[in-house]
Interface confidence: low
């Protein structure tokens, strides 16, 4: 999947077509049982928007765990002390006090904008991960697609979409090219750092969203 930001999408984005569950052999972008038909089933209470977002984030976190497992098994990056070396090359989204997502100084509006903006910024890094896995290739694709679905859920929830800045596709494309041109060690380290940062960002988002 080659998409650097949702700004590349046409007027319909990809509607809720993304909510359909993939065949069992392929990880879906939504948790099992989240098919639109299931949600409407008479025997089950439909999920609220907040519950769906919560479930979606936990689903992505599961996917990240699987990817981290492969990364850590493949190299010793997970124990490396040289992370700072590679981290300087990356500008991975991070939660800061001013974003209003922490308990002290919590602010729903600014926090939601930060979460959506951060996820949009992570998209180029998730694109980078697409060719970085062998046995978990499908899982990497599922994490990417699930994140797109999560962004759509959150955009529905956000009232002030004007405040959300979409990453510049040109900048993203040159960043992607630069990341792919790194030597093997740096590419492995970059993969590890992206997964770790994305996990931390999602965990912070999950905590914040539970307060909304």
């Amino acid at each position: 999947m080659n998409s650097f930001s949702t700004s590349a999408f046409g007027p319909v984005a990809f509607s809720l077509g993304l909510l359909l569950v993939l065949p069992a052999a392929f990880p879906a972008p939504v948790p099992p049982g989240e098919d639109s038909k299931d949600v409407a089933a008479p025997h089950r209470q439909p999920l609220t928007s907040s519950e769906r977002i919560d479930k979606q984030i936990r689903y992505i976190l599961d996917g990240i765990s699987a990817l981290r497992k492969e990364t850590c098994n493949k190299s010793n990056m997970c124990e490396s002390s040289k992370e700072a070396l590679a981290e300087n090359n990356l500008n991975l989204p991070k939660m800061a006090e001013k974003d209003g997502c922490f308990q002290s100084g919590f602010n729903e509006e600014t926090c939601l904008v930060k979460i959506i903006t951060g996820l949009l910024e992570f998209e180029v890094y998730l694109e980078y991960l697409q060719n970085r896995f062998e046995s978990s290739e499908e899982q990497a694709r599922a994490v990417q697609m699930s994140t797109k679905v999560l962004i759509q859920f959150l955009q529905k929830k956000a009232k002030n979409l004007d405040a959300i800045t979409t990453p510049d596709p040109t900048t993203n494309a040159s960043l992607l090219t630069k990341l792919q041109a790194q030597n093997q060690w740096l590419q492995d380290m970059t993969t590890h750092l992206i997964l770790r940062s994305f996990k931390e960002f999602l965990q912070s988002s999950l905590r914040a969203l539970r307060q909304m």
């Epitope: 077509g17 993304l18 510049d168 494309a173 090219t177």
Partner: antibody
Framework: DVQLQESGPGLVKPSQTVSLTCTVT??????????WSWIRQFPGNKLEWIGY???????TYNPSLTSRTTITRDTSMNQFFLEMISLTAEDTATYYC???????????WGQGTSVTVSS | DIQMTQSPASLSASVGETVTITCRSS??????LTWFQQRQGKSPHLLVY???TLAEGVPSRFRGRGRGTQFSLQINSLQPEDFGTYYC?????????FGGGTRLEIK
């Protein structure tokens, strides 16, 4: 008005290499959000995507053709190229260059250039 | 690779009639489906993207439907210029693949 124009040798001998050029007018191939593809159509009308080059220069190939295919570009001439090695009769097709907005659709095609592989 | 299966391979209809062409993907492709028309000796021409969005300048008699693995293109009130070959194509990741085409002929 955006236009894409393919050019190539027409006839190529088996095992040889073909080089095709796509000249783009009306838009720079470095314009953000666009990718520039090569797609071929076999005599029976079957279409096959060969690969594309992003406006940034990043390239993605069809895995089934990646070992024989190279896509490059010349931004100063606003052209992009396809080179395919070790041709066989099965590579006989009309080769199209095309533009798409990624995750959107191929919205402009060239008129196609015919490549016949024959001794 | 994702396989795209189009049916029927060919059909004949008269001007004014309504026809439906279907396209099935071997995997869920959500709404990442495009329909093209190709007239004899011409390049393919974009009709519908994202499964159901009409491209600019395409008449409203064309209608794309579906998501997931089942898609269709309906053409209402056929016009002489609608005859040709129709292709579906997915762009859910790479490699992109195309349907085998449906040839629409004048009865």
């Amino acid at each position: 008005d955006v236009q894409l124009q393919e050019s190539g040798p027409g006839l190529v001998k088996p095992s040889q290499t073909v080089s095709l050029t796509c000249t783009v007018t009306g838009i720079s191939i470095t314009t953000g959000n666009y990718r520039w593809s090569w797609i071929r159509q076999f005599p029976g009308n079957k279409l096959e995507w060969i690969g594309y080059i992003y406006y940034s220069g990043a390239i993605t190939y069809n895995p089934s053709l990646t070992s024989r295919t190279t896509i490059t570009r010349d931004t100063s001439m606003n052209q992009f190229f396809l080179e395919m090695i070790s041709l066989t009769a099965e590579d006989t097709a009309t080769y199209y260059c095309a533009r798409d907005r990624y995750d959107y659709a191929v919205d402009f095609w060239g008129q196609g250039t015919s490549v016949t592989v024959s001794s | 690779d994702i396989q795209m299966t189009q049916s029927p391979a060919s059909l004949s209809a008269s001007v004014g009639e309504t026809v439906t062409i279907t396209c099935r993907s071997s995997e869920n492709i959500y709404s990442f489906l495009t329909w093209f028309q190709q007239r004899q000796g011409k390049s393919p021409h974009l009709l519908v993207y994202y499964a159901n969005t009409l491209a600019e300048g395409v008449p409203s008699r064309f209608r794309g439907r579906g998501r997931g693995t089942q898609f269709s293109l309906q053409i209402n009130s056929l016009q002489p210029e609608d005859f040709g070959t129709y292709y579906c194509q997915h762009h859910y990741g790479t490699p992109w693949t195309f349907g085998g085409g449906t040839r629409l002929e004048i009865k």
